[in-house]
């Protein structure tokens, strides 16, 4: 029961996390204009991974996509890649974990197969979460670097008494959504891996078999001991647990391959 709960909870947490990663990736507020030096601006700038937006005094918001691919900073491309890899892995993980759920019966799927699928999806969620956290962190680092660089040469156009304040950007809502979502996906993945262990305890050195000590087949005779142990052909004997534990080199690894959009 605890295993089912852990698996189910892991699935739900991962589902929320991946939904969050998708939301963060699509959001326009990855970086927002820092209002510290210009709190009365009537023009508010904010940027996402795919487009930049400007909200004007009228309340009208205009967004323009980054229609170039080669002209974009390599770091932005890397963040895009990390987020997309995270989404793809997470989506595959969700698909796999649906079939792995103990509460869902699909044909005559054995528990060992479910355990393997649970572990696979768990690892995928962990990698997905790490991709999202890495992507958001790289972007945040880029923002911090640019923030202090623009602070260093804050007033760039000192033309007489007129000053041109360079627009500085700070953390947008999408970064926090991304960090939380990545963390949730990671936690969900760990829970799936824990559930997998519950589904299939590690195999010991000896084969796990059931011992049948049937009364009629054991004979006690004076002067000797004869026992029919039923050890013969074990084809009819069922294992108590279907072993789902796999050695580390058996676990499938999924390459982080990604075509840039």
């Amino acid at each position: 029961m605890a295993v089912t709960a852990c698996q189910g909870l892991g699935f739900v947490v991962s589902l929320i996390g991946i939904a969050g990663i998708i939301a963060a990736t699509c959001m326009d507020q990855w970086s927002t204009q820092d209002l510290y030096n210009n709190p009365v601006t009537a023009v508010f700038n904010y940027q996402g991974l795919w487009r930049s937006c400007v909200r004007e005094s009228s309340g009208f918001t205009e967004c323009r996509g980054y229609f170039t691919l080669l002209g974009l900073p390599a770091m932005l491309q890397a963040v895009r890649a990390l987020m997309i890899v995270g989404i793809v892995l997470g989506a595959i993980g969700l698909l796999v974990s649906i079939f792995a759920l103990k509460c869902i019966r699909i044909g005559s799927m054995e528990d060992s197969a479910k355990a393997n699928m649970t572990l696979t999806s768990g690892i995928m969620f962990i990698v997905s979460g790490l991709c999202a956290i890495a992507g958001v962190s790289v972007f945040a680092n880029m923002l911090v670097t640019n923030f202090w660089m623009s602070t260093a040469n804050m007033y760039t156009g000192m033309g007489g008494m007129v000053q041109t304040v360079q627009t500085r950007y700070t953390f947008g809502a999408a970064l926090f959504v991304g960090w939380v979502a990545g963390g949730l996906t990671l936690i969900g993945g760990v829970m799936m891996c824990i559930a997998c262990r519950g589904l299939a305890p590690e195999e010991t050195n000896y084969k796990a078999v059931s011992y049948h000590a049937s009364g009629h087949s054991v004979a006690y005779k004076p002067g000797g001991f004869k026992a029919s142990t039923g050890f013969g052909s074990n084809t009819k004997n069922k294992k108590i647990y279907d072993g789902g534990a796999r050695t580390e080199d058996e676990v499938q690894s999924y390459p982080s391959k990604h075509d840039y959009v």
């Epitope: 009365v40 023009v43 930049s52 005094s57 009228s58 000053q163 041109t164 627009t167």
Partner: antibody
Amino acid sequence: QVQLVQSGAEVKKPGASVKVSCKASGFTFTSYNIHWVRQAPGQGLEWIGYISPGNGGSNYNLKFKDRATMTSDTSISTAYMELSRLRSDDTAVYFCATGRGFAYWGQGTLVTVSS
Amino acid sequence: DIVMTQSPDSLAVSLGERATINCKSSQSLFNSGNQKNYLIWYQQKPGQPPKLLIYRASTRDSGVPDRFSGSGSGTDFTLTISSLQAEDVAVYYCQNDYSYPLTFGGGTKLEIK
């Protein structure tokens, strides 16, 4: 088409308050900010502030911060601007404006403050 | 606050001639986020509300005749009427649309010579 229809002219005594309304039609009322601008007789334009009907947020010119109150009623697509503690130099035509670059203006409401 | 200074205060131009009105702001109205200048030009005739001519320094509003054009960047802006018509007689205002409080120029009264 976009229209902003303002309430009629008002005559007030110094120290009193006036509430001017601006009824919008022809666009999604909550999508754009409603700005208020005034123009004293024979003078230039002066920005009072704006209200954002979508979220109720507002921004005031510090000159009017303690006397002006902007509200809106989204159910009837109407914005209001109330100016309290009126003085004789508040005599002006009060306009509401909206749209990109203030593309749409109300016809104006003349507020006369006289004892 | 950003101070908007218009020049000249009044201008008399012959019909069919070019009219030029200048506007200077005390701070830059250039937004680096989208590389646009947030300056607006209005035309106001007696007893009427102002009418939008140009926004973002150079973008003509729909329905505005193409004889009206806006130019400039940063702190210096110009409204040009390429060929003055009788119906262009009015007061013209520039407005800072970049920083609160939004501020207007003092106005330029355009007349026919």
